[in-house]
């Protein structure tokens, strides 16, 4: 992807040097418009057949400094009667996200990009029954 | 959070200037180890009672340039018989992620942080029945 643009106005840049030292504006913009979050109902975590809880993960040297992580409430799914269904498993949907971590003791301050795997919510899947050979 | 470190070696900084110009190393580190992705079974999207498909969202001026976005396959959930259950809705679980967008025409090239709301997977919730007054 054209992350390293080349133009007549910019001298050629070694990719490796470029990647290790880019300037970033940390003032956050919404790429999907101001109303972006209104489309995210917050009650799915309770209403789902595979309900989850959210835990606040804090790291003062990370940007974002707070990330909410999901954990499934049960190993099984909840059926229409509100009982746990032993044929169905509640599983965590995870996503790999990018975060910025401050380099220790850096001055002027620099960050490095890190990948982090976070739980976002849970879904219900049929248990896989292992058949005897 | 300690986004703006102050030490005896670093002079005071106006927050707004700081946030608009930090240095970032874009060489990606895994905060959870090299095998991070291997813990994400990719068959949930087919096995779930609220299955989903993944679509490739590409933007050459974004870091990461490729993001996979989920879309629920059905409006309803799939029951044990493989039929759609009209009492249960398949809903998209979304997460706000951080991406870096290249500032147009910037030279030397700079990025700004953007928030993006992406679909990660789907979950099954009971339909809300609107009661007549």
């Amino acid at each position: 992807a054209a992350i390293i643009p080349q133009s007549s106005a910019c001298p050629n840049t070694e990719a490796k040097d470029f990647l290790q030292n880019v300037k970033v504006n940390l003032k956050v913009f919404n790429s999907l418009g101001a109303k972006v979050s209104s489309r995210r109902p917050s009650d799915y975590l309770n209403r789902s057949t595979s309900p989850w809880t959210l835990h606040r993960n804090e790291d003062p040297d990370r940007y974002p400094s707070v990330i909410w992580e999901a954990q499934c409430r049960h190993q099984r799914c909840v059926n229409a009667e509100g009982k746990l269904d032993h044929h169905m498993n509640s599983v965590l949907i995870q996503q790999e996200i990018l975060v910025l971590k401050r380099e220790p003791e850096s001055c002027p301050f620099t960050f490095r990009v890190e990948k982090m795997l976070v739980g976002v919510g849970c879904t219900c899947v049929a248990s896989i029954v292992r058949q005897a050979a | 959070a300690a986004i703006i470190p102050q030490s005896s070696a670093c002079p005071n900084t106006e927050a707004k200037d700081f946030l608009q110009n930090v240095k970032v190393n874009l060489k990606v580190f895994n905060s959870l180890g090299a095998k991070v992705s291997s813990r994400r079974p990719s068959d949930y999207l087919n096995r779930s009672t609220s299955p989903w498909t993944l679509h490739r969202n590409e933007d050459p001026d974004r870091y990461p340039s490729v993001i996979w976005e989920a879309q629920c396959r059905h409006q309803r959930c799939v029951n044990a018989e493989g039929k759609l259950d009209h009492h249960m809705n398949s809903v998209l679980i979304q997460q706000e992620i951080l991406v870096l967008k290249r500032e147009p025409e910037s030279c030397p090239f700079t990025f700004r942080v953007e928030k993006m709301l992406v679909g990660v997977g789907c979950t099954c919730v009971a339909s809300i029945v609107r009661q007549a007054a």
Epitope: S42, D43, L45, L54, Y63, S65 | A2, T13
Partner: antibody, heavy 119, light 107 residues
């Protein structure tokens, strides 16, 4: 401009419950956490807990876990804190404040709600 | 939890004076300290975040400094409208904790 408008003063009996509100305006309610803080002359300011209206997540100071319940209604951009089994120790001024999860600091506060618990 | 010890509790000063308030954290909080001004009948207002960064629209007579455990808030030339309670808060991690406040009175 950003505003957090809190409900008016409350006088309640011991043993009862009360629900305080914090109505947000001037920004997208779902994008920021709302935190609650208790202020008394003796103990000063104490952090109670947080709710993220966007995802429904809550976290509490252990000291208030059995006392406070935080909720939010996105349709009215309002955060609520319910305090239960009230005693005179719960008499205080309660504030809501907005927290920026990316940058990691609090920027706006409500004007406070005075709660008096008395028979 | 982290204890924030703020001194002094009261300050009686004249307009034009220089005022210094300190906050000491019981453990390192990096630079995750904010300073607020609370006037009677109003909402507390953020003056300084990240220990030393003046918040948008805050007059430059208000400054902050410090890192780790020791933090200082200064009003270089006190004005009559600065009558208020000033307090620090650590936003390093929950439970977020506060200094006891300093009541500034003008002679």
């Amino acid at each position: 401009q950003v505003q957090l408008q809190q409900s008016g003063a409350e006088l309640v009996r011991p043993g009862a419950s009360v629900k305080l509100s914090c109505k947000a305006s001037g920004y997208t309610f779902s994008d920021y956490e709302i935190h609650w803080v208790k202020q008394t002359p003796v103990h000063g300011l104490a952090w109670i807990g947080v709710i993220h209206p966007g995802n429904g997540g809550t976290a509490y100071n252990q000291k208030f876990k059995d006392k406070a319940t935080l909720t939010a209604d996105k349709s009215s951009s309002t955060a609520y804190m319910e305090l239960s089994s009230l005693t005179s120790e719960d008499s205080a001024v309660y504030y809501c404040e907005r927290f920026l999860t990316y940058e990691g600091y609090f920027d706006y506060w409500g004007q406070g709600t005075t709660l008096t618990v008395s028979s | 939890s982290i204890v924030m010890t703020q001194t002094p509790k009261f300050l009686l000063v004249s307009a034009g004076d220089r005022v210094t308030i300190t906050c000491k954290a019981s453990q390192s909080v990096n630079n995750d300290v904010a300073w607020y001004q609370h006037k009677p009948g109003q909402s507390p207002k953020l003056l300084i975040n990240y220990a030393s960064n003046r918040y948008t629209g805050v007059p430059d007579r208000f400054t902050g400094s410090g890192y780790g455990t020791d933090f200082t808030f200064t009003i270089s030339t006190v004005q009559a409208e600065d009558l208020a309670i000033y307090f620090c808060q650590q936003d390093y991690g929950s439970p977020y904790t506060f200094g006891g406040g300093t009541k500034l009175e003008i002679k």
